[in-house]
């Protein structure tokens, strides 16, 4: 007789998953030589250990603690970039301004980014066919917990001047709900941060409206004012030729705004 | 029917090396990963490491770090073990077992073991 | 390390007994357990695993139970047969380790 088991409404855990995460670990520490030391079986260890067997909606901040202490990374404080929304420019960014870093850059972001995993309480089956969603079945399930752990640590890491891309083609440029609006806003240090600097991204080609007064971003320079840090803001024009210009600097076409 | 065979009984001087062999069958050599663990003498069993042939990385208790090579031959569907500077406490009956990649279950085979004897 | 600790480290009993072993973790472990059974001159058997769930063929007379640090493999019936040393192991974390074996023999 089959088990019944839990329907949830999101995927299931991502094919191959632990063969993924392994894979993305022997692969990070092979290019990261200060990662080197990381055994990658013992991170699998930690990973399985905060969500296997566990009911997949009571998932604590607790539960990765092991596999947070194994990811222990060093990045340098001040070359932080924030996302929210726009997660494929970020990344295109940090590939080629290698001195800068998104939280998927680092061991932990990497393994986990655009994966989804979940087990079920009482047995030490991974899930395959069906995970909690966030709004439709509960917000402490393994993938959001997980990602609100590591964006928590990496903000709190964050000081000096601090960047965040936000996407201008959205409705709400800054979203309180979002990972960045609901956590990493709360959680960068005053006394080490100076500066959050965001860069609004615009779509379209024609579009030059000052997307720095939209309503939104004044809630966030509100947020941020009252966290006794100061607020900058710069409008990206041109996403294709911001990145043009971080490639190539010395480009003539670089002096003028993008 | 899964098998894991290993290779034959070894004896061995203090401070020379040891390779010895377990050969997978009936089962899909990389969807698994294979450890090593030995039995001294009337004594229990003792963890050495872990590999996986799929992606090719291994790991080890510390206390045969620098002495344990663990690895494996896809082609031929073999894990090897091999240790260097023998002892006499290395006296040992060595067992390979398998294990899914994921660690989710217990080492479900094991081979038939493989005694060395190390004496001058 | 997590240390694994077995008692008793031999007993008696006579067939139709009841037999308890129990195994305790250094630290917590959740239900990365296994329970092994070995004879003279063989390899181990697997014989629980996840602390409670039966290898595929083991007979249903065994049994496993706990979590956490605190394990108990049972045999409810003891047969013949299952006179051998029993192992528990931890899965948890690296490097696996093992209890030091209890030695089940004929009273």
């Known amino acids: 007789v089959p088990r019944w088991r839990q329907q949830w409404s999101g995927p299931g855990t991502t094919k191959r998953f632990p063969e993924t995460v392994l894979a993305r670990c022997v692969k990070y520490t092979e290019i990261h030589p200060e990662m080197r030391h990381v055994d990658c079986q013992s991170v699998w260890d930690a990973f399985k250990g905060a969500f296997i067997s566990k009911h997949p909606c009571n998932i604590t901040e607790e539960d990765y603690q092991p596999l947070m202490k194994l990811g222990t990374q060093t990045v340098p404080c001040n070359k932080i970039l924030l996302w929210s929304r726009i997660k494929d420019l970020a990344h295109q960014f940090t590939q080629v301004q290698r001195d800068m870093f998104t939280l998927e850059d680092t061991l932990l972001g990497y393994l986990a980014d655009d994966l989804t995993w979940c087990g079920e309480f009482n047995t030490s089956k991974i899930n395959y066919q069906s995970c909690p969603d966030w709004r439709k079945d509960c917000s402490n399930n393994p993938v959001s917990v997980f990602w609100k752990t590591v964006s928590r640590r990496f903000a709190e890491a964050a000081c000096d001047v601090v960047h965040v891309m936000l996407n201008g083609s959205r409705s709400k440029i800054f979203d309180k709900n979002s990972t960045f609006g609901s956590v990493e806003v709360h959680n960068l240090q005053p006394e080490k941060v100076q500066t959050l600097e965001a860069w609004v991204i615009h779509g379209g080609r024609e579009d030059s409206r000052d997307l720095c007064q939209d309503p939104t971003i004044k809630e966030l320079e509100s947020i941020i004012s009252k966290r006794n840090i100061q607020f900058s803001c710069k409008n990206i024009y041109r996403p294709d030729k911001f990145l043009q210009c971080v490639k190539n600097p010395e480009d003539s076409s670089c002096t003028s705004e993008i | 029917q899964v098998q894991l065979v290993q290779s034959g009984a070894e004896v061995k001087k203090p401070g020379s090396s040891v390779k010895v062999s377990c050969k997978a069958s009936?089962?899909?050599?990389?969807?698994?990963?294979f450890s090593w663990v030995r039995q001294a003498p009337g004594q229990g069993l003792e963890w050495m490491g872990r590999?996986?042939?799929?992606?090719?990385?291994?790991n080890s208790a510390q206390k045969f770090q620098g002495r344990v090579t663990i690895t494996a031959d896809k082609s031929t569907s073999t894990a090897y073990m091999d240790l260097s500077s023998l002892r006499s406490e290395d006296t040992a009956v060595y067992y390979c077992?398998?294990?899914?990649?994921?660690?989710?279950?217990?080492?479900?085979?094991w081979g038939q073991g493989t005694l060395v004897t190390v004496s001058s | 390390d997590i240390q694994m600790t077995q008692s008793p480290s031999s007993l008696s009993a006579s067939v139709g007994d009841r037999v308890t072993i129990t195994c305790r973790a250094s630290?917590?472990?959740?239900?990365?357990l296994a329970w092994y059974q070995q004879k003279p001159e063989k390899a181990p058997k697997s014989l629980i695993y996840?602390?409670?769930s039966l290898q595929s063929g083991v007979p249903s007379r065994f049994s496993g139970s706990g979590s956490g640090t605190d394990f108990t493999l049972t045999i409810s019936s003891l047969q013949p047969e299952d006179f051998a040393t029993y192992y528990c192991?931890?899965?948890?974390?690296?490097?696996?380790?093992f209890g030091q074996g209890t030695k089940v023999e004929i009273k």
């Open positions: 077992a398998r294990d899914d990649i994921a660690a989710l279950g217990p080492f479900d085979y």
């Open positions: 009936g089962g899909t050599f990389s969807s698994y990963a």
């Open positions: 590999v996986i042939p799929q992606l090719g990385i291994a």
């Open positions: 630290q917590g472990i959740s239900s990365w």
């Open positions: 996840a602390a409670s």
């Open positions: 192991q931890q899965y948890n974390s690296y490097p696996r380790t």
